[in-house]
Interface confidence: low
């Protein structure tokens, strides 16, 4: 997956730091105070649709076969720049019973972006 | 995730059968001859962006917090109807050396759709 460098407008991963204080979650999340969540942005022209290279690969490759052949309804289906690989992160937080929980939360960090 | 029923245009899962013969893969895929891959389609208005309810949930919920507050660059970031839960499937196929391989291929079947 591409890293956004400001030079291309093709689907890429953009660095972004989330502050839990900013979104009002610091009352239940003990640590960390924030993290690099990142996000995906950019265009998905038809020639790179389905080139996610990761988690959606088989499915998106199959769908792209139909899309490239102009098969309805895929010809009009817009391809999107989305996370294709996400990574977990350890967090320390309070549960409803005010117990302190340490847990790996799945899909917190965007590692790669691709066109759906 | 919603199932598409033709009545709504909100992001939903659409049933779709893939025929390996149709896409010219029947020369290397022994079985099955096809499968219900499904796909996602529909609108993602801002109030349901980030409500994937599954694999992208934490990340998309966080990003949506910023989006709902009109935080640049997320306010203009378009939310997409994408697979949020995929399922593997067993396949029998020939590898490059013409050996017969039986393998669970990850992320073949779209189980749920959501707004990124």
């Amino acid at each position: 997956g591409l890293e956004c460098d400001g030079k291309v407008n093709i689907c890429c991963k953009k660095q972004f730091f989330v502050s839990f204080k900013d979104i009002g979650w610091n009352d239940w999340i003990i640590a960390p105070s924030g993290y690099h969540a990142n996000y995906c942005e950019g265009e998905c022209p038809s020639h790179i649709a389905g080139t996610s290279g990761s988690s959606l690969s088989f499915h998106s490759t199959v769908i792209n076969h139909y899309r490239m052949r102009g098969h309805s309804p895929f010809a009009n289906l817009k391809s999107c720049c989305v996370p294709t690989k996400l990574r977990p992160m350890s967090m320390l937080y309070y549960d409803d019973g005010q117990n302190i929980i340490k847990k790996d939360i799945q899909n917190m960090i965007v590692e790669e972006c691709g066109c759906s | 995730g919603l199932e598409c029923d033709g009545k709504v245009n909100i992001c939903c899962k659409k049933q779709f059968f893939v025929s390996f013969k149709d896409i010219g893969w029947n020369d290397w895929i022994i079985a099955p001859s096809g499968y219900h891959a499904n796909y996602c389609e529909g609108e993602c208005p801002s109030h349901i962006a980030g409500t994937s309810g599954s694999s992208l949930s934490f990340h998309s919920t966080v990003i949506n917090h910023y989006r709902m507050r009109g935080h640049s660059p997320f306010a203009n970031l378009k939310s997409c109807c994408v697979p949020t839960k995929l399922r593997p499937m067993s396949m029998l196929y020939y590898d490059d050396g013409q050996n017969i391989i039986k393998k669970d291929i990850q992320n073949m079947i779209v189980e749920e759709c959501g707004c990124s």
């Epitope: 640590a31 960390p32 350890s90 320390l92 117990n99 302190i100 847990k103 790996d104 | -």
Partner: antibody, heavy 121, light 107 residues
């Protein structure tokens, strides 16, 4: 091979503070919990609190809240436990312990040798 | 916090016999339970984690079972080096809590 090496025995006066160190070697320091467990003479094990060095934030057992401070220095792979307002009942062996694997909900596979803190006037 | 209760407090067993130690949690800890062995003047040693998985280098005579709130540590045939204090510990939630211990002594 993971090793946790603690600082030496201390004798302290009531009302004072003690700071015990725990130096880790033989593994990634940042992503693993370092926990502190104490054991008073002839008594059982008592969890005081823990820190995930990469976060730099600690959590403490309610009993010790406000009296204990757990910190970690990633540059030296060392964790510290400071206990203030010492009283005679704080006389105990203090252990640092580390979880078995990176991630969550793992037991303490690695233990320091223990530091005896004696509080006496 | 989750209270861990061990029984019996003391268990007198002859070498070669079987020892069964119990641990009860005040609420479910799933399988997030460990057993430790401690000998005088030594740090605790991890025996079992995940309620039933033996830690590296632990002999097969040690086995753990249970989930939720009821757990058991079994030592199938006690050796002289097994006479020690055994603690259960839940690590499902912080604060992490230990049981009061069971002392296994020679009969």
């Amino acid at each position: 091979q993971v090793q946790l090496v603690q600082s030496g025995a201390e004798v302290k006066k009531p009302g004072s503070s003690v700071k015990v160190s725990c130096k880790a070697s033989g593994g990634t320091f940042s992503n693993y919990d370092i926990n502190w467990v104490r054991q008073a003479p002839g008594q059982g094990l008592e969890w005081m609190g823990g820190i995930i060095p990469v976060f730099g934030t600690a959590a403490y057992a309610q009993k010790f809240q406000g009296r204990v401070t757990i910190t970690a220095d990633e540059s030296t792979s060392t964790a510290y436990m400071e206990l203030s307002s010492l009283r005679s009942e704080d006389t105990a062996v203090y252990y640092c312990a580390r979880e078995a694997r990176d991630g969550y909900r793992y037991a303490f596979q690695h233990w320091g040798q223990g530091t005896l803190v004696t509080v006496s006037s | 916090e989750i209270v861990m209760t061990q029984s019996p407090a003391t268990l007198s067993v002859s070498p070669g016999e079987r020892a069964t130690l119990s641990c009860r949690a005040s609420q479910s800890v799933s399988s997030n339970l460990a057993w430790y062995q401690q000998k005088p003047g030594q740090a605790p040693r991890l025996l079992i984690y995940g309620a039933s998985t033996r830690a590296t280098g632990i002999p097969a005579r040690f086995s753990g079972s249970g989930s939720g709130t009821e757990f058991t540590l079994t030592i199938s045939s006690l050796q002289s080096e097994d006479f020690a204090v055994y603690y259960c510990q839940q690590y499902n939630n912080w604060p992490i809590t230990f049981g009061g211990g069971t002392k296994v002594e020679i009969k």
